[in-house]
C-alpha cells in the first residue's frame, strides 16, 4: 500500500493548523521523516499536488536526535483556497537505503463538522501558592479534530510556550476534546483579571473562533 | 548502551500503577515489545531482579497489530515491599533476528516528592445537551509522574473506560499535571449530585489519596 512503511523509518504528513489557515491565512503542511540512519546518503522529499498544478517553494530542516537517528522535515506553504477546496498534496520520500519510496498524502478532512464548546475554569487559591493560579480550558465535541488553542490577556495573545494543550482525544460520542492549561501570576491578574481561552476551528462561526473568558476572582 | 534499540524494534518496561501499588496492593510491571516482524522465530522475554532474588510467575500475551507487526507483552507481579524498598527489575528480550538482546530495567523513581493538588469542575448546561454534562479534573504539581486517577459516584468507583485521562506532562515548575474528563448523565446526577475525582499518588497523605468532590448543580 502507498502508505506502508519500510521497517524502521516513518514518515508523517501534517495538515495546516486552523490558526495558520483561518487567522494568519498562511497555511503550511509539513512532511516529517524520522528514524533515519545518518550518513547513509541523502534523503529526498519531493512535493506534488493531485491536480498536477505546481507547488510553492518548500523549506527543509535536518536534525540529529539524541538517539543518533536523523529527522528531516520539509514545510510547504499551501494556498488557503486550494486547501479549503479540497486539493490533495503528496510528499514522496526517497533514500538509497529505502527499498521503495515512501508516499504520504494529505487533504482537508471529510465527514461531519461540529463547532467546539469552550469552557474555562480558574483554580482556587492553594496553600503556599498565593501568587500563582492555574487556568484550565476544556474544548470539546468538535469535528474534525484539527484545532488551535490560544490564550489572551488584555487582547494580547500569550506566547504558545506559556500554555500546555493536550492532543485531541475522542469523546464518548463522535467528537473530540482537548484540555489547555495556563499558569498566571498575581501581577497578571491584578493588571486585568480576565483571561480568554480561544479555539480556532473550521466549524466555529463566525470567523472560525469560539472563546470563553475566565477570571481568577470571579464575581468580584 | 543497555537501553539502545536495534532499528525497528522497541521495548518498554512500565512501573506499577499507584492504584495497584497502594490501593489494590498487588503491583505488576509490564514489558512491552513492539514492531516485531511476525513468523520470524519466537520472542523470549526473561525477567530478573538486580538483587538476584527469584521472580514471580509472569503472564505473556501476543497480539498482531493492524499494520502487520507483532506486539508481545509480559506482565510480572512484584512484591509491594520489594518495589517500595527500591528493588530493580530487568526484562531481557531475545529473538533470532535481533543482533543483540534488548535489556530494559525499572525501579522506583528517585528524586523529590510532591503531593498532587486536585481541582474538579463541572461544565454548565450547553444548548442541545440538557441531559448530559462533562466533569473535568485537573491534578497538578505532583512528583514523581506516576499517578492513578479514578472517578467515584455514590462511593462506587466508576469503570476506567468511563473517563479519559491525559498522560502526565511537565508544569512550568518541577512537577507534573494531568487532566481527566468524565461525561455524566442526568440520571446519575439526579440520583446523587456528587462525583469524586480521586488521585492515587505516593506523596499524598494520608493513605496515598487526594480527592475533590464536584456537583453538576453546586449550591442547589
Amino acid at each position: 500500500a502507498a502508505d506502508s512503511n519500510p521497517r524502521g523509518v516513518s514518515a508523517y504528513l501534517s495538515r495546516p493548523s486552523p490558526f495558520d489557515l483561518f487567522i494568519r491565512k498562511s497555511p503550511t503542511i509539513t512532511c516529517l521523516v524520522v528514524d533515519l540512519a545518518p550518513s547513509c546518503g541523502t534523503v529526498n522529499l519531493t512535493w506534488s499536488r493531485a491536480s498536477g498544478k505546481p507547488v510553492n517553494h518548500s523549506t527543509r530542516k535536518e536534525e540529529k536526535q539524541r538517539n543518533g537517528t536523523l529527522t528531516v522535515t520539509s514545510t510547504l506553504p499551501v494556498g488557503t483556497r486550494d486547501w479549503i477546496e479540497g486539493e490533495t498534496y503528496q510528499c514522496r520520500v526517497t533514500h538509497p537505503h529505502l527499498p521503495r519510496a515512501l508516499m504520504r498524502s494529505t487533504t482537508k478532512t471529510s465527514g461531519p463538522r461540529a463547532a467546539p464548546e469552550v469552557y474555562a475554569f480558574a483554580t482556587p487559591e492553594w496553600p503556599g501558592s498565593r501568587d500563582k493560579r492555574t487556568l484550565a480550558c476544556l474544548i470539546q465535541n468538535f469535528m474534525p479534530e484539527d484545532i488551535s488553542v490560544q490564550w489572551l490577556h488584555n487582547e494580547v495573545q500569550l506566547p504558545d510556550a506559556r500554555h500546555s494543550t493536550t492532543q485531541p482525544r475522542k469523546t464518548k460520542g463522535s467528537g473530540f476534546f482537548v484540555f489547555s492549561r495556563l499558569e498566571v501570576t498575581r501581577a497578571e491578574w491584578e493588571q486585568k483579571d480576565e483571561f480568554i481561552c480561544r479555539a480556532v476551528h473550521e466549524a466555529a462561526s463566525p470567523s472560525q473562533t469560539v472563546q470563553r473568558a475566565v477570571s481568577v476572582n470571579p464575581g468580584k | 548502551a543497555a537501553d539502545s534499540n536495534p532499528r525497528g524494534v522497541s521495548a518498554y518496561l512500565s512501573r506499577p500503577s499507584p492504584f495497584d501499588l497502594f490501593i489494590r496492593k498487588s503491583p505488576t510491571i509490564t514489558c512491552l515489545v513492539v514492531d516485531l516482524a511476525p513468523s520470524c522465530g519466537t520472542v523470549n522475554l526473561t525477567w530478573s531482579r538486580a538483587s538476584g532474588k527469584p521472580v514471580n510467575h509472569s503472564t505473556r500475551k501476543e497480539e498482531k497489530q493492524r499494520n502487520g507487526t507483532l506486539t508481545v507483552t509480559s506482565t510480572l507481579p512484584v512484591g509491594t515491599r520489594d518495589w517500595i524498598e527500591g528493588e530493580t527489575y530487568q526484562c531481557r528480550v531475545t529473538h533470532p533476528h535481533l543482533p543483540r538482546a534488548l535489556m530494559r530495567s525499572t525501579t522506583k523513581t528517585s528524586g523529590p516528592r510532591a503531593a498532587p493538588e486536585v481541582y474538579a469542575f463541572a461544565t454548565p448546561e450547553w444548548p442541545g445537551s440538557r441531559d448530559k454534562r462533562t466533569l473535568a479534573c485537573l491534578i497538578q504539581n505532583f512528583m514523581p509522574e506516576d499517578i492513578s486517577v479514578q472517578w467515584l459516584h455514590n462511593e462506587v468507583q466508576l469503570p476506567d473506560a468511563r473517563h479519559s485521562t491525559t498522560q502526565p506532562r511537565k508544569t512550568k515548575g518541577s512537577g507534573f499535571f494531568v487532566f481527566s474528563r468524565l461525561e455524566v448523565t442526568r440520571a446519575e446526577w439526579e440520583q446523587k449530585d456528587e462525583f469524586i475525582c480521586r488521585a492515587v499518588h505516593e506523596a499524598a497523605s494520608p493513605s496515598q489519596t487526594v480527592q475533590r468532590a464536584v456537583s453538576v448543580n453546586p449550591g442547589k
Epitope: 488584555n154 494580547v156 501581577a187 491578574w189 491584578e190 493588571q191 480576565e194 468580584k220 | -
Partner: antibody
Framework: EVKLVESGGELVQPGESLRLSCSTS????????MSWVRQPPGKALEWLGF??????????EYSTSVKGRFYISRDDSQNILYLQMNTLRPEDGATYYC?????????????WGQGTSVTVSS | DIQLTQSPASLSASVGETVTITCRTS??????LAWFQQRQGKSPHLLVY???ILAEGVSSRFSGSGSGTQFSLEINSLQPEDFGTYYC?????????FGAGTKLELK
C-alpha cells in the same frame, strides 16, 4: 452613590505618629482593594500603597518612600480604611486621599475621597 | 520603577478647541494607562483606564489612545469645566506611579 470620607489629618511635629481613617459607603467594601494616595501642596500625586480584599488575604503593598513607616489596614465590619503613619517627616506634609481600586483592573483606581490635610512642622 | 513623562507641562486653550496631552512611559506598559482630571481645590477624577476605556459618566469628548510607551488624551470641543490639571498613571504593576501633570488653562 460611592462615597469615601477621610478624617484624622492635622498638624503634627516631626517624629510623631498619626492615624488617618476613611469611611466608605455606596459599594460592597469587602470586595475591593483600597489605596492611599497623597499630594503635597502644588505638587503631583504619589501612590502610597494598597490593601487587598479578604479573598486575597488582606495583603498590602507599599511605595518605597513609605515602606516600614506607613501601614494600611481595614475593618470590613465597619467599612473603614486606615493609614497609620509613624516617624513623620516634614516632607510627609500633603493632602491624603483614600481611593478605591477598580475590579478586574486591580492596579487602576476609580473613586477618590475629598482628602484630609496633614502638616508636619515643628 | 516606571517613570511617566507628561507633555506639555502646561497649555492654554479656548473653549471649543481640541487639545491633546501625551504621556510617555520608561518601559512598555502595554495598554495599562489611566488619565485623571483634577480641578482646582478638588479631588482627582478618573477619565480613562486601560488606555482607551472611558470611565462611567465621562463625556465622550474625552478619548484615550496609545499602547506600549506612548499614550495620549484628546479633549474635543473644550468646555469651561475641562480646565484643570491632568495626570496619567500606569496600572501595569507595583509601584503605581503618576505623571507630573499637565495644567490646562483658559486662554
Amino acid at each position: 452613590e460611592v462615597k469615601l470620607v477621610e478624617s484624622g489629618g492635622e498638624l503634627v511635629q516631626p517624629g510623631e505618629s498619626l492615624r488617618l481613617s476613611c469611611s466608605t459607603s455606596g459599594f460592597t467594601f469587602t470586595d475591593y482593594y483600597m489605596s492611599w494616595v497623597r499630594q503635597p501642596p502644588g505638587k503631583a500625586l504619589e501612590w502610597l500603597g494598597f490593601i487587598r480584599n479578604k479573598a486575597n488575604s488582606y495583603t498590602t503593598e507599599y511605595s518605597t518612600s513609605v515602606k516600614g513607616r506607613f501601614y494600611i489596614s481595614r475593618d470590613d465590619s465597619q467599612n473603614i480604611l486606615y493609614l497609620q503613619m509613624n516617624t513623620l517627616r516634614p516632607e510627609d506634609g500633603a493632602t491624603y486621599y483614600c481611593v478605591r481600586n477598580k475590579k478586574v483592573y486591580y492596579y487602576a483606581v476609580d473613586y477618590w475621597g475629598q482628602g484630609t490635610s496633614v502638616t508636619v512642622s515643628s | 520603577d516606571i517613570q511617566l513623562t507628561q507633555s506639555p507641562a502646561s497649555l492654554s486653550a479656548s473653549v471649543g478647541e481640541t487639545v491633546t496631552i501625551t504621556c510617555r512611559t520608561s518601559e512598555n506598559i502595554y495598554s495599562y494607562l489611566a488619565w485623571f482630571q483634577q480641578r482646582q481645590g478638588k479631588s482627582p477624577h478618573l477619565l480613562v483606564y486601560d488606555s482607551k476605556i472611558l470611565a462611567e459618566g465621562v463625556s465622550s469628548r474625552f478619548s484615550g489612545s496609545g499602547s506600549g510607551t506612548q499614550f495620549s488624551l484628546e479633549i474635543n470641543s473644550l468646555q469651561p469645566e475641562d480646565f484643570g490639571t491632568y495626570y496619567c498613571q500606569h496600572h501595569y504593576g507595583i509601584p503605581l506611579t503618576f505623571g507630573a501633570g499637565t495644567k490646562l488653562e483658559l486662554k
